[in-house]
């Protein structure tokens, strides 16, 4: 029995609902009484949801899953996963048994956009050209881990003297803090770009130092 799932991962934002698509081709005369459907976590074989003996057996996964009962007879075995969490990320196996049996695995990629970075400067007063300053770029509650890029006002990448740390909170979302140590010129703009590699979403922050005063656009 050929079971079909999308080749590409399903991308779902944290807190939203995701549909894990799975389909099979029912033969003529097929009835739901013949169908045995199992969704499970691929790596641990933990049962997620099942359908057997003509009945939805319900969710075994925190009561956040549902089938599409009206579409099962047409060969649609997709699973709805509600209120997606970081911990849901991974591979789900769809097993279908009628007379023959088969299975396929679909990957769920969880994502969350990063907040607009906040910029801080240390020291933040009495700055002169030639002073060494520490610029911190902070962005919050994103997933997966971010890519961080720094550049100056002319768009030239700044790669030296950058330290980036990412810490996951209890929900598995990352807070990113990137520190740039730089020697001030006469004036200058320093930009931080926090990129979510899954969403291809960029969050920008910048600070402009013009002797006095400083501005934080």
């Amino acid at each position: 029995l050929e079971v079909q799932v999308p080749e590409d991962p399903v991308v779902a934002l944290v807190g939203t609902d995701a549909t894990l698509c799975c389909s099979f081709s029912p033969e003529p005369g097929f009835s739901l009484a013949q169908l045995n459907l199992i969704w499970q976590l691929t790596d641990t074989k933990q049962l997620v949801h099942s359908f057997a003996e003509g009945q939805d057996q319900g969710s075994a996964y925190a009561n956040r899953t549902a089938l599409f009962p009206d579409l099962l007879a047409q060969g649609n075995a997709s699973l709805r996963l509600q209120r997606v969490r970081v911990a849901d990320e991974g591979s789900f196996t769809c097993f279908v048994s009628i007379r023959d049996f088969g299975s396929a695995a679909v990957s769920l990629q969880v994502a969350a956009p990063y907040s607009k970075p906040s910029m801080t400067l240390e020291p933040n007063k009495d700055l002169r050209p030639g002073d060494t300053v520490t610029i911190t770029c902070s962005s919050y509650r994103g997933y997966p881990e971010a890519e961080v890029f720094w550049q100056d006002g002319q768009g030239v990448p700044l790669t030296g003297n950058v330290t980036t740390s990412q810490m996951a909170n209890e929900q598995g979302l990352f807070d990113v803090h990137s520190v740039l140590r730089v020697v001030l010129g006469a004036n200058g703009t320093y930009s931080c770009l926090v990129r979510n590699p899954v969403l291809q979403q960029d969050a920008h922050g910048s600070v402009t130092i013009t002797g006095q005063p400083m501005t934080f656009p």
Epitope: V3, N36, I38, Q40, T42, D43, T44, K45, S91, T93, C94, F95, S97, F101, G102, S103, A104, A105
Partner: antibody, heavy 119, light 110 residues
């Protein structure tokens, strides 16, 4: 039609490592299947050794876990068994088998290969 | 000694019906699917029943499976001499390990 074929030395010395390979033909080792090793000592019953998924996830028989490693080679479309510190009690016919993920059953088996542990 | 037990042997005449039992516990059969395998002399096991009671394509309906609680049963009707073989039940336990019964030798009486 998917087929499995075991290969490896038929004789292994005590304390050495038993190494077997299972070649998958007519299908891909990267499909939605778990790949298992099962053995059967002469005149005795079946004993499951362990399994692997193409992602690298493994499960092992607790009684053999400390001595067993199962690996998968996607480029060669095969998976392997390594059982170290063997004794004569490891003498058996070794089978590789497929479990379609979710089926909880082994629907395709290799023909088996006899491995004798003796000095 | 297997944690899943089967009778060592059963026998019946051709055309008769025979059942083979498989007894386990809540940590294996009680909470997992049972499969059944036929092993003819000198050959690899062959899947007869999966998911407690389902037959793969090509397996005649003379073979049936059932499960109740922590026990499972394989039934064979219309016994044929070609059915003479060893039969194994298989299941899984809570540690994600497959477990086989000790096997039952079926003799078809001439």
């Amino acid at each position: 039609q998917l087929q499995l074929q075991e290969s490896g030395p038929g004789l292994v010395k005590p304390s050495e490592t038993l190494s077997l390979t299972c070649a998958v033909s007519g299908g891909s080792v990267s499909s939605s299947n778990w790949w298992s090793w099962v053995r059967q000592p002469p005149g005795k019953g079946l004993e499951w050794i362990g399994e692997i998924y193409h992602s690298g996830s493994t499960n092992y028989n607790p009684s053999l876990k400390s001595r067993v490693t199962i690996s998968v080679d996607k480029s060669k479309n095969q998976f392997s068994l390594h059982l170290n510190s063997v004794t004569p009690e490891d003498t058996a016919v070794y089978y590789c088998a497929r479990e379609v993920a979710g089926s909880a059953a082994f629907d395709i088996w290799g023909q088996g290969t006899m491995v004798t542990v003796s000095s | 000694q297997s944690v899943v037990t089967q009778p060592p042997s059963v026998s019946a005449a051709p055309g008769q019906k025979v059942t083979i039992s498989c007894s386990g516990s809540s940590s294996n059969i009680g909470n997992n699917y049972v499969s059944w395998y036929q092993q003819l002399p000198g050959t690899a096991p062959k899947l007869l029943i999966y998911g407690n009671n389902k037959r793969p394509s090509g397996i005649p309906d003379r073979f049936s499976g059932s499960k109740s609680g922590t026990s499972a049963t394989l039934g064979i009707t219309g016994l044929q001499t070609g059915d003479e073989a060893d039969y194994y039940c298989g299941t899984w336990d809570s540690s994600l390990s497959a477990v086989f019964g000790g096997g039952t030798q079926l003799t078809v009486l001439a």
